[in-house]
């Protein structure tokens, strides 16, 4: 079945700028299928703008001006590109990337859609680092010893545009946990959002990860927020300083626990 | 030019309680175009319900029923038993993909309609709380309430800055709620819940125990090397009515 | 049968005006970016200015911006471009085109007969 | 801007013949960009090629496009009374402006 990753979460410009959005096509090849291209204005229907067929031929809505958007995709790569020329206001908006996923009959096929990157046009000179700034919460004994339960919350404060998303896995596994999370909220001029995570017991003695994706995390990966294996019985250790965990990058967790 | 319009912007719908969407077409025949639906999650993300002939997403058969209603012009799609991870906006498309003509494998698409989804009504349920904190940082979790209506009160008298608390429906059908602070005496901070007409605190549920009876990190698990911005730990200390941690990049 | 129709062309002295119409006919106007293409006597073609369907986004060549402003009335099918401090080098014929078929990608399948600007003292 | 330059400026052949017309552009232009048009005194253009190999609805199969990056052609492989005119390729695809080529006459020798 064909699967489409928009890698790009979001994507902030200057007006009068080029924006460019990916969309990584897997389980099929590019270049045997058409890419689609649809946008979502803010308070608008969602809407075709351009597709590339196989064959490289382009289609284009006929409301847009040839120029304003150029679509492609690379083989190699198995990704389609959707540049928008000369970005203003009227271009903010979600950008999806969809397909129509191979079924045997013409008249059962789906159309598939990419998660959308949201293009943001900003006139604001930001500060040199507007990623999310991790904090975190471990399990408050209370919990633990009443419910049999503990619950890890991720803190991310000071990050610039306000798309970000969130989820939570178990050290050594991809699946996705259930988790809850707050809305984004604005202060002064980034923002802050906060995700927690409710574990069993049994799970306590495990390693979680709260995976943030956002546009200006550090080498364009996502970020993981280690959350240490708990055990029900001991210590606690001073909190004089902190670091998260890039991709590719380690972390010392620095704790102070007891009683809440 | 045809236009997909749904019935209602807005539909809240009970857990487990059928709820049914409408989409209209104007300006051409329903039956001559493919009908299909799509949901919107938090996240951008949009997931394919349900195509004409049939035709479910992953996931969506047992749950989710399509349907045309040709004499009325619109399409219908009924959620049986709606869940919390319903929630989201619902667009109905349209297509003529496979159907001869003028061959159009663009969507055509409607305005989504919110569904919003609330708990059953339920006996009422009052809530635990329990603080967590991290350096100027202090989190109030109140857990498992019925009904929604709750005020959530950090206690302390050097209040750097509050935010609105996050309330949302649990697995279980029920409330959590977290409401997040930032206070310069974050250790003697509680949190006090009005609910239902009482009053509930955080010292409610602090457990009393020796200081050997803390939560900790597992040793063997927490011995990752430090990046240059890392330090050592210091020393063991035992804190009373405090549970720490921090984190910065 | 899709017809554009120009109009408005005419002799103009040096720093004059001018406004052109370019009517549409057979079209679903609305839903349609229009385009004003030149071309001056024994000479290539030359792009001018581009409007979107809801006039959402404007383009323009650089030798024309600040002079010349596109515009259009969906209500009356009409595309417009008024020239203002018209030169000597605007002397063409002015053509309407239109990308009409999605398929073509943007390309113009859809042109107006013309209508000739003359700029001259 | 992308400037698109066309050669021969002129080209000299019998009916019958083959006619090979090309189109550079001083930076790589996407291929689903690259558009020919055929133009006859007094008359407006008429889109032959788009995408620079797929011919408009209605254009006999003579006329073909091809190339990529910054080197496309347009082929007529037998030159019919009615196809001597005047040819421009146009690049449609990048930010405005949207530029033409000279153009290439092909007149009857």
């Known amino acids: 079945a064909g699967h489409l990753e928009q890698p790009q979460i979001s994507s902030t410009k200057t007006l009068s700028k080029t924006a460019r959005l990916e969309c990584v096509v897997s389980g099929i090849t590019i270049s045997a299928t058409s890419v689609y291209w649809y946008r979502e204005r803010p308070g608008e229907v969602i809407q075709f703008l351009v597709s590339i067929s196989y064959d490289g031929t382009v289609r284009k809505e006929s409301g847009i001006p040839s120029g304003k958007f150029e679509v492609d995709r690379i083989p190699e790569t198995s990704t389609s590109t959707l540049t928008i020329h000369n970005v203003e206001k009227q271009d903010i908006a979600t950008y999806y990337c969809a397909l129509w996923e191979a079924q045997q009959e013409l008249g059962k096929k789906i159309k598939v859609f990419g998660p959308g990157t949201k293009l943001i046009i900003t006139d604001k000179q930001l500060d040199a680092d507007v990623s999310p700034k991790p904090t975190i919460f471990l399990p408050s004994i209370a919990e633990t010893k009443l419910q049999k339960a503990g619950t890890y919350l991720c803190l991310l404060e000071k990050f610039f545009p306000d798309v970000i998303k969130i989820h939570w896995q178990e050290k050594k596994s991809n699946t996705i946990l259930g988790s809850q999370e707050g809305n984004t909220m604005k202060t002064n001029d980034t923002y802050m959002k906060f995700s927690w995570l409710t574990v069993p017991e049994k799970s306590l003695d495990k390693e979680h990860r709260c995976i943030v994706r956002h546009e200006n995390n550090k080498n364009g990966v996502d970020q993981e927020i280690i959350f240490p294996p708990i055990k029900t019985d001991v210590i606690t250790m001073d909190p004089k300083d902190n670091c998260s965990k890039d991709a590719n990058d380690t972390l010392l967790l620095q704790l102070t626990n007891t009683s809440a | 030019a045809i236009e997909l319009v749904p019935e209602h912007q807005t539909v809240p719908v009970s857990i487990g309680v059928p709820a049914t969407l409408r989409c209209s077409m104007k300006g051409e025949a329903i039956g001559n175009y493919y009908i299909n639906w799509y949901r919107k999650t938090q996240g951008n993300t949009m997931t394919f319900i349900y195509r004409e002939k049939d035709i479910y997403g992953p996931g969506f058969k047992d749950n989710f029923q399509g349907d045309i209603d040709i004499a009325k012009n619109l399409a219908v799609l009924k959620i049986l038993a709606p869940s919390e991870r319903d929630e989201g906006s619902y667009y109905c498309a349209c297509d003529t993909l496979g159907m001869g003509g003028e061959y159009t494998d663009k969507l055509i698409f409607g305005k989504g309609t919110r569904v919003t989804v609330e708990p059953r009504s339920q006996p009422h349920t009052k809530p635990s709380v329990f603080v967590m904190k991290n350096g100027t940082n202090v989190a109030c979790l109140v857990k498992e309430f019925y009904p929604k209506d709750i005020r959530i009160n950090l206690v302390s008298s050097k209040k750097i800055t509050e935010f609105d608390p996050a309330i949302v429906i649990s697995p279980s059908g029920k409330y959590n709620a977290v409401k997040l602070g930032k206070y310069e005496d974050s250790n003697s901070v509680t949190c006090s819940v009005q609910h239902d007409n009482k009053t509930v605190h955080s010292t409610d549920f602090e457990v009393k125990t020796d200081s050997t009876d803390h939560v900790k990190p597992k040793e063997t698990e927490n011995t990752k090397q430090p990046s240059k911005s890392c330090h050592k730990p210091k020393a063991i200390v035992h804190t009373e009515k405090v549970n720490m941690m921090s984190l910065t990049v | 049968e899709v017809q554009l129709v120009e109009s408005g062309g005419g002799l103009v002295k040096p720093g004059g005006s001018l406004r052109l119409s370019c009517a549409a006919f057979g079209i679903t106007f609305s839903s349609y970016s229009m385009d004003w293409v030149r071309q001056a006597p024994g000479r290539g073609l030359e792009w001018v200015s581009s409007?979107?369907?809801?006039?959402?986004?404007?383009f323009y060549a650089d030798s024309v911006k600040g002079r010349f402003t596109i515009s259009r009335d969906n209500a009356k099918n009409s595309l417009y471009l008024q020239m203002n401090s018209l030169r000597a080098e605007d002397t063409a014929v002015y053509y309407c085109a239109t990308s009409y078929s999605w398929n073509y990608g943007g390309a113009f399948d859809i042109w107006g007969q013309g209508t000739m600007v003359t700029v001259s003292s | 801007e992308i400037v698109m330059t066309q050669s021969p400026g002129t080209l000299s052949l019998s009916p019958g013949e083959r006619a090979t017309l090309s189109c550079r552009a001083s930076?790589?232009?996407?291929?689903?960009?690259l558009a020919w048009y055929q133009q006859k005194p007094g008359q407006a253009p008429r889109l032959l090629i788009y995408?620079?190999?797929s011919r408009a609805t209605g254009i006999p199969d003579r006329f073909s496009g091809s190339g990529s990056g910054t080197d496309f052609t347009l082929t007529i492989s037998r030159l019919e009374p009615e196809d001597f005119a005047v040819y421009f390729c146009q690049q449609y695809g990048s930010s405005p402006p949207y530029t033409f080529g000279q153009g290439t006459k092909v007149e009857i020798k």
């Open positions: 409007i979107g369907s809801s006039s959402s986004y404007i």
């Open positions: 995408g620079a190999s």
């Open positions: 930076q790589s232009v996407s291929s689903s960009y």
